[in-house]
């Protein structure tokens, strides 16, 4: 029997899946706070637009009986169980917020006919790309691969005069959900990253990684890994590193680099950190006061999901259009809306665009500094620091393959 959508006659609801298995180990109360804060803002915006309507959220909790591991790897069926709950209750909002786990989202897409929009704070994997009614509010793996390929190919910057075409990828399987799918995308033989490289090898053991650092016969000077500096230190410790090794540490959802008193530890000097440009206002928000720098982005994605719902509601109501239509379900893409922290842009496939930031450690000040930024919307790298104080020779990034014979440096222009 049909599930009725609580989505007409001046009353509009968003169904929020509150799953034990989540992309980030975030207490559900914090997610709820983010949603409620978003609802307050949406109500204000609709009122200001002269739209006298009611907007609410219904939180759908999983019972946690079957899926109690709390991580995304065991979440394949949890989203479907929650959908069954909705089906049994015969009640659904205009929009579904969640799940954040790639497996859950993928499975829900396979097993259901989703005629309503779905917003996710996560679903990072390539298997969730190009889904017609899915919107993802945290950078998916596809965006990372586009940055890496763009950066590898770049050879006309004062600090990067070589195109790279090789890489090691460290992936030991203990990564967080975002890292798991980011590295998965780099590992996949069909991915854009693999396609554009002439050599790529996945290192799965700590010892493999440690050996490469000083191996004269290594096939690449570049190692991509994902995690925070502490994760790198546990792996690398204070081991000696060959002078032309470059470690790219992907740590997108971590604002700790942008705290004023942070000094980069010595083991970070051979490392370029890829993270995201931080927002300002979120830091003082009532729901985020107790969040660590790594949790803000997840809570913010939920809040922005609510604001996106509000934006679409406003747009359709102002145009006198019906909300419970396929047109509404497919409209959550190719737009910019006013997020909590400024404008948020979604690409043609409903994936959030962002500014990625590549940081290096200044050998002079031992502080993190911005080397370049990358706009995912236009796939463009913008150099910021034209004379970086690198640890690498001549303050330039080395070639990805060390010349073992006479030192002829060929510039691949």
């Amino acid at each position: 029997s049909q599930v009725s959508q609580n989505c007409h006659n001046g009353s509009y609801e968003i169904s929020v899946l509150m799953m034990d298995n989540s992309a980030f180990a975030e207490p559900l109360e914090n997610v709820e706070d983010a949603v409620n804060e978003g609802l307050e803002i949406v109500r204000g915006r609709l009122q200001n637009a002269g739209l006298n309507v009611t907007v609410n959220a219904s939180f759908m909790y999983s019972d946690g009986l079957i899926h109690n591991s709390g991580d995304c790897r065991s979440s394949t069926c949890e989203g479907l169980d929650l959908l069954r709950k909705i089906s049994n209750a015969k009640r659904m909002g205009c929009v579904l917020m969640g799940p954040s786990c790639t497996y859950s989202t993928f499975q829900m897409y396979l097993d259901t006919e989703l005629s309503y929009p779905m917003i996710s704070a996560g679903s990072f994997g390539l298997s969730c790309d190009y889904k017609e009614t899915l919107t993802r509010l945290m950078s998916p793996a596809r965006k990372l691969t586009y940055f890496l390929v763009n950066f590898w190919k770049t050879n006309d910057l004062p600090f990067k005069t070589y195109s790279w075409s090789t890489s090691y990828v460290y992936k030991n399987g203990t990564e967080s959900e975002d890292c798991f799918w980011y590295l998965n995308a780099l590992e996949a033989s069909v991915s854009y990253f693999s396609h554009e490289l002439s050599f790529k090898l996945v290192l799965r053991q700590d010892k493999e990684f440690q050996d490469i650092l000083m191996d004269h016969n290594r096939k690449s000077n570049v190692i991509v890994m994902c995690g925070d500096p502490e994760f790198l230190y546990k792996l690398k410790g204070d081991r000696a590193v060959a002078e032309d090794i470059v470690i790219i540490l992907v740590d997108l959802f971590n604002d700790q680099y942008f705290e004023d008193n942070v000094t980069a530890p010595d083991y970070m000097k051979n490392v370029l950190v890829l993270t995201q440009s931080p927002g300002n206002s979120l830091l003082n928000s009532s729901f985020s006061r107790n969040l660590s720098p790594t949790k803000r982005d997840f809570a913010l994605a939920y809040l922005n999901g609510i604001l996106l719902f509000g934006h679409m509601l406003k747009t359709f109501l102002e145009n006198g259009e019906n909300i419970t239509t396929p047109k509404f379900a497919h409209a959550f893409r190719n737009l910019t809306f006013e997020g909590y922290d400024g404008p948020v842009t979604l690409d043609d496939w409903g994936d959030v665009d962002s500014t990625m930031v590549l940081l290096y450690t200044s050998v002079d000040t031992k502080k993190y500094k911005v080397l370049l930024t990358y706009d995912t919307h236009v796939n463009q790298t913008n150099p910021v620091d034209m004379s970086p104080t690198f640890t690498w020779k001549n303050s330039k990034l080395p070639n990805d393959i060390t010349d073992r014979g006479p030192q002829h440096h060929h510039h691949h222009h």
């Epitope: 705290e259 440009s277 931080p278 930031v357 502080k367 911005v370 913008n382 910021v384």
Partner: nanobody
Framework: QLQLVESGGGLVQPGGSLRLSCVTS????????IGWFRQAPGKEREGVIC???????KYADSVKGRFTISRDNAKNTVYLRMDSLKPDDTAVYYC?????????????????WGQGTQVTVSS
């Protein structure tokens, strides 16, 4: 003493590009936030872009995706690259500096200003 000198302005057609330079002296760029501002005839001065002392660019919505900022500490110079220029971008462009209290945020106000360079976008 602390000085800022802008250059690179001129007349450009809509859709064209310009690169403005701000040569600084009397201070270290690492310790200062640099802002670019503009003032069109009969309008108030507005912030266009700021580069925090840590090197984080922050853009006004009106120029995001079109303007980029970079710095070369070795040359004590900050650059403003302007692409896809529109007639609305016509103004005198100023660079300004402020001793950084935060490495990652733009200051509320700037203490030191250049004399400005004229940018005219017209066909």
């Amino acid at each position: 003493q602390l000085q800022l000198v802008e250059s690179g302005g001129g007349l450009v057609q809509p859709g064209g590009s310009l690169r403005l330079s701000c040569v600084t002296s009397g201070f270290t760029l690492d310790d200062y936030a640099i802002g670019w501002f503009r003032q069109a005839p009969g309008k108030e001065r507005e912030g266009v872009i700021c580069l925090t002392s840590g090197g984080l660019p922050k853009y006004a919505d009106s120029v995001k995706g079109r303007f980029t900022i970079s710095r070369d500490n070795a040359k004590n110079t900050v650059y403003l690259r302007m692409d896809s220029l529109k007639p609305d971008d016509t103004a005198v462009y100023y660079c300004a500096a402020s001793g950084a209290t935060s490495r990652w945020n733009c200051p509320p106000q700037y203490d030191h200003w250049g004399q400005g360079t004229q940018v005219t976008v017209s066909s």
